[in-house]
């Protein structure tokens, strides 16, 4: 069974001091993010017993294996069902605690009832505050039965459940009609899946005979031991104040386990700790009684004394539960209560015995669960004991179960049952996962789901080039870490497989399925340098670069140009997809921006070293376009242009630029500066007669602005060919020659 305990502190004078703690003794319990162990969960279960909403309860984790619930503000917060869930995978287990209000109308004589399949269960609700009305019994929140209040017997209402079956398990309650549900008596009924003393799928297997109030688990035949007892059959008492499957946990506080209720995995349920009893576990056992809830009687013989925590303490010369066995009777010594082996191993098992007459090799035998008897192959005789060694045939899964070492002499006999767990080595169900790759290394996550049994002690990663017949390379890693496979060949496929191992001889599992992982291509090594650059406009930049000359083919697929705008914290990347390219035009840049520029060669997804950076300042963008441009022919060689200044200027205009082009002509346009920015009119001279011209203009502040609309106009008459257009400005408003 899973080593999981839910502790309830029942010192109820102040609900704010009440707490529930869930403690797991499982290896790796509660780590949560770790693939090997989900977290412990502790919560109030409101599905059956609903209480008025209050402030949320506080959950505190204390290390990986303990979680505590606090923050109860009023007594009604405590009433109901609480559960703790722990363990991993198929071992995930829920432990349940049911809390009754001490002030309820009805109180359970016993909260947890564990019964066998087919038994009659009797739930008894004691009248605490009488009401002369019906008592309603419910099962898992649904109506179950009604009792007339006259049907009380000795101040108790009894619910008899004959021939119970596992589906009858659950939370039962007894409530007076019309009373608050918080005044109910709440019970927990646990019905084992088998009849008394049996376990297994068909209930064909015999329980080990759990001692000290331990309960045989109907699925695995293990004893779930009461708090304060340990061993395969719960035969051994813990030291006072300790609990857990190996007595590894300690009760908090100076009064030990007083006032604590312990809940363990089904089919045990809940009880007080060893040595304590009562509804609040605050009463010590009466003389002659011991154990959880003081349910056990000592009945010590031969001068033994009763200890309320451990039972009979025997004088020298005597042993046994009631000190009924003389030390002259042979006795099995120090037999481990549980042994674990891996499937298909051939372990050696030792069994030591003492007594008078002294046990010899032939008087000690080992019995397997199927009844097969093994005789020892050798014995080591020492003054105080004989140790027989047994060579076990190759183990199969059916060998899991209770084995027995038996010693027989003329002085009597003794036997000790112990649990053998045959574990299946883990086999990965999936291939490892590639995290990152480079040209000569692969980073791999080996954590995969697996069949078989944990815990995982080591992970081996086997790898070799795809389609290779060479030996596999192997790397052994920690289960929780990623693995880096190094010194690989670039651009090569590797077959990679995981092998998991669990502790013990023969714990290595079969290899998992292979997966193909491919290394990246080689990193480009050449560092380009920037030859030069020039601005082709306020938002355009032409860049050129070179590469060093090296022998052999160029390792690279293209170039990456990076422009860093430090002011805005923005990076622009331009991909040039030809390795032969040595120039690029960058467009759509931000005018007036200071850029840092570099270039680097790339190959596949890998980048080579960047060139030394260059710093480039783009000119700011110019002003808006002049408005209402108009052309008017004055003669056969002159056309007058008039316009209005641009709106919303960012600063004073330094000049205007006029573009002149013959309509339909193929030649380059002519640009003419108007150097007096206050002008709103100019005369273009030297034009050809009877020729159609196109005009547009723009203003300049620090950079050239947007072009205006284009206007058309033809010169007059049929004069001589002019030498070329020139310009004369005038203030249009005044009409004066300039």
């Amino acid at each position: 069974a899973v080593d999981l305990t839910l502790l309830a502190n029942l010192r109820l004078t102040d609900p704010q001091r009440f707490f529930l703690t869930c403690v797991s003794g499982e290896a790796g319990a509660g780590r949560g993010s770790d693939a090997w162990g989900p977290p412990l969960l502790l919560e109030k279960d409101d599905r059956i017993v609903r209480t008025p909403p209050g402030p949320p309860l506080r959950l505190a984790r204390n290390g990986s294996h303990q979680v505590t619930l606090r923050g109860f503000s009023k007594p009604s917060d405590l009433v109901g069902v609480f559960s703790c869930v722990g363990g991993a995978g198929a071992r995930r287990t829920r432990v349940i605690y049911v809390h009754n209000s001490p002030g309820a109308h009805l109180l359970p004589d016993k909260v947890t009832h564990t019964v066998n399949k087919g038994d009659t269960a009797v739930l008894s609700a004691r009248v605490h505050k009488e009401k002369q009305t019906d008592v309603i019994w419910k099962s898992n929140g649904s109506y179950f039965y009604t009792l007339d209040w006259h049907e009380a017997q000795d101040g108790r209402f009894l619910l008899q459940l004959p021939n119970v079956q596992p589906p009858s398990s659950g939370i039962y309650s007894a409530t007076y009609l019309e009373a608050s549900p918080l005044g109910s008596a709440f019970f927990r009924l646990i019905v084992r899946g088998c009849g008394a003393g049996r376990w297994g799928p068909g209930c064909t297997k015999e329980c080990p005979g759990c001692l000290h109030g331990g309960v045989c688990h109907d699925h695995d035949g293990e004893c779930v031991c009461p708090p304060g007892f340990t061993g395969t059959r719960c035969e051994q008492a813990c030291r006072e104040g300790r609990f857990g499957q190996s007595c590894q946990e300690q009760c908090p506080g100076i009064s030990g386990c007083r006032g604590l209720t312990f809940c363990l995995p089904d089919p045990y349920g809940c009880s007080c700790g060893s040595g304590w009893r009562g509804s609040q576990c605050q009463e010590a056992c009466a003389p002659g009684h011991f154990g959880a809830d003081c349910r056990l009687q000592c009945q010590c013989q031969n001068g033994g004394t009763c200890d309320r925590f451990s039972g009979c303490v025997c004088p020298s010369g005597w042993h046994g539960v009631h000190c009924e066995k003389s030390d002259r009777i042979p006795q099995i010594l120090n037999m481990a209560s549980e042994l674990e082996f891996n499937l298909e191993t051939m372990p050696r098992i030792n069994c030591a015995a003492a007594g008078n007459p002294f046990p010899v090799r032939g008087s000690i035998e080992l019995r397997k669960p199927d009844g097969t008897v093994l005789l020892s192959t050798k014995a080591i005789v020492e003054p105080e004991k004989t140790t027989a060694e047994f060579e076990v045939p190759r183990l199969v899964l059916a060998d899991s179960g209770f084995w027995e070492c038996r010693v027989s002499t003329s002085g009597g006999q003794d036997s000790r049952r112990f649990k053998v767990n045959v574990k299946v080595p883990p086999v990965p169900l999936a291939a490892p996962r590639l995290l990152t790759k480079q040209s000569r290394q692969l980073v791999v996550s080996p954590l995969v789901s697996f069949s078989g049994d944990g815990p995982i002690s080591t992970v081996r990663l086997h790898y070799r080039p795809q389609d290779s017949t060479m030996d596999w390379s192997t790397i052994v890693v920690d289960p929780s870490e990623n693995v880096t496979l190094m010194n690989l060949r670039p651009k090569t496929g590797y077959s990679v497989r995981v092998q998991l191992s669990r502790p013990g001889e023969g714990g290595e599992g079969a290899w998992g399925p292979p997966t193909l992982m491919t290394t990246d291509c080689p990193e480009p090594l050449l560092q380009p340098w920037l030859e030069g650059w020039h601005v082709e406009g306020t938002d355009r930049l032409r860049v050129s670069w070179s590469l060093p000359l090296v022998p052999g083919p160029l390792v690279g697929d293209g170039f990456l140009l990076r422009l860093w705008d430090g002011t805005r914290g923005q990076e622009r990347r331009e991909n040039v997809s030809s390795p032969q390219a040595r120039t690029a035009l960058l467009t759509g840049l931000t005018p007036g921006t200071h850029y840092q520029l570099d270039v680097q060669l790339y190959h596949c997804t890998l980048l080579g070293p960047a060139s030394p950076p260059a710093h480039v300042l783009l000119p700011p963008s110019g002003p808006p376009a002049p408005r209402h441009l108009h052309a008017q022919a004055l003669s056969d060689s002159e056309i007058q242009l008039t316009w209005k200044h641009p709106e919303a200027l960012p600063g004073p205009i330094s000049k205007y630029v006029v573009e002149v082009q013959v309509a339909g002509g193929a030649g380059d346009p002519l640009w003419i500066d108007v150097d007096r920015p206050e002008e709103t009119s100019t005369i273009i001279r030297g034009l050809n007669a009877s020729t159609r011209y196109l005009f547009r203009m723009r203003a300049s502040i620090q950079g050239l602005g947007d072009w205006s609309n284009t206007v058309e106009e033809s010169t007059l008459g049929n004069g001589l060919q002019a030498e070329g257009p020139v310009q004369e400005s005038r203030a249009a408003e005044e009409g004066l020659d300039q």
Partner: antibody, heavy 119, light 110 residues
Framework: EVQLLESGGGLVQPGGSLRLSCAAS????????MSWVRQAPGKGLEWVSS????????YYADSVKGRFTISRDNSKNTLYLQMNSLRAEDTATYYC????????????WGQGTLVTVSS | QSALTQPASVSGSPGQSITISCTGT?????????VSWYQQHPGKAPKLMIY???NRPSGISNRFSGSKSGNTASLTISGLQAEDEADYYC??????????FGGGTKLTVL
């Protein structure tokens, strides 16, 4: 579907006896409180008797106490009303009814059986 | 076990609302929330209409509603319809594990 079917009514002379039965189906009869309610011709409803699931708790209207006995057989899912020393004023349609679980009202009724006490 | 007191008859026109009162004692209506109302058409078994003072079983129209004040319970039927014409009985569980019924009210839809 919950069904209650009464039987056993008929004509009986004053001082005579009659046993009514109510066959229940469609629910777990053995856990419910069951009742008999009667209605004299042209008159209102009158509760007669109730019995608890175990059969241990039985209650009667003052008008029938000592003369009528309510009982049940949980194995047969049947409710009974043994009526002795019948009087003319016991003439009525007798309804068998189920008490709602965990509550104080009658949620399902049979169609009734007529008992006539007359000489 | 004296009967609860109801008016012998009430009437109303279609679409109107009517209320039927039911007066008991502190041992029945006053002591419990277990007040129920039943409708009975001639020759038929009673049918549960309201339980625990205010609750309607599934399938019962929301035109039927119940309330309670002290020792008196009331059944209100709004938007009267012809099919509502029937006898109505109130009932209460008592502190002596018995039931008591009202004398019944005949509802006539004009």
């Amino acid at each position: 579907e919950v069904q209650l079917l009464e039987s056993g009514g008929g004509l009986v002379q004053p001082g005579g006896s009659l046993r009514l039965s109510c066959a229940a189906s469609g629910f777990t009869f053995s856990v419910y409180v069951m009742s008999w309610v009667r209605q004299a011709p042209g008159k209102g409803l009158e509760w007669v008797s109730s019995i608890y699931p175990s059969g241990g708790g039985t209650y009667y209207a003052d008008s029938v106490k000592g003369r009528f006995t309510i009982s049940r057989d949980n194995s047969k899912n049947t409710l009974y009303l043994q009526m002795n020393s019948l009087r003319a004023e016991d003439t009525a349609t007798y309804y068998c009814a189920r008490r709602k679980a965990a509550a104080g009202y009658l949620d399902y009724w049979g169609q009734g059986t007529l008992v006539t006490v007359s000489s | 076990q004296s009967a609860l007191t109801q008016p012998a008859s009430v009437s109303g026109s279609p679409g109107q609302s009517i209320t039927i009162s039911c007066t008991g004692t502190s041992s029945d209506i006053g002591a419990y929330k277990h007040v129920s109302w039943y409708q009975q058409h001639p020759g038929k078994a009673p049918k549960l209409m309201i339980y625990e003072v205010t609750n309607r079983p599934s399938g019962i129209s929301n035109r039927f509603s119940g309330s309670k004040s002290g020792n008196t319970a009331s059944l209100t039927i709004s938007g009267l319809q012809a099919e509502d014409e029937a006898d109505y009985y109130c009932s209460s569980y008592t502190s002596r594990n018995t039931w008591v019924f009202g004398g019944g009210t005949k509802l006539t839809v004009l």
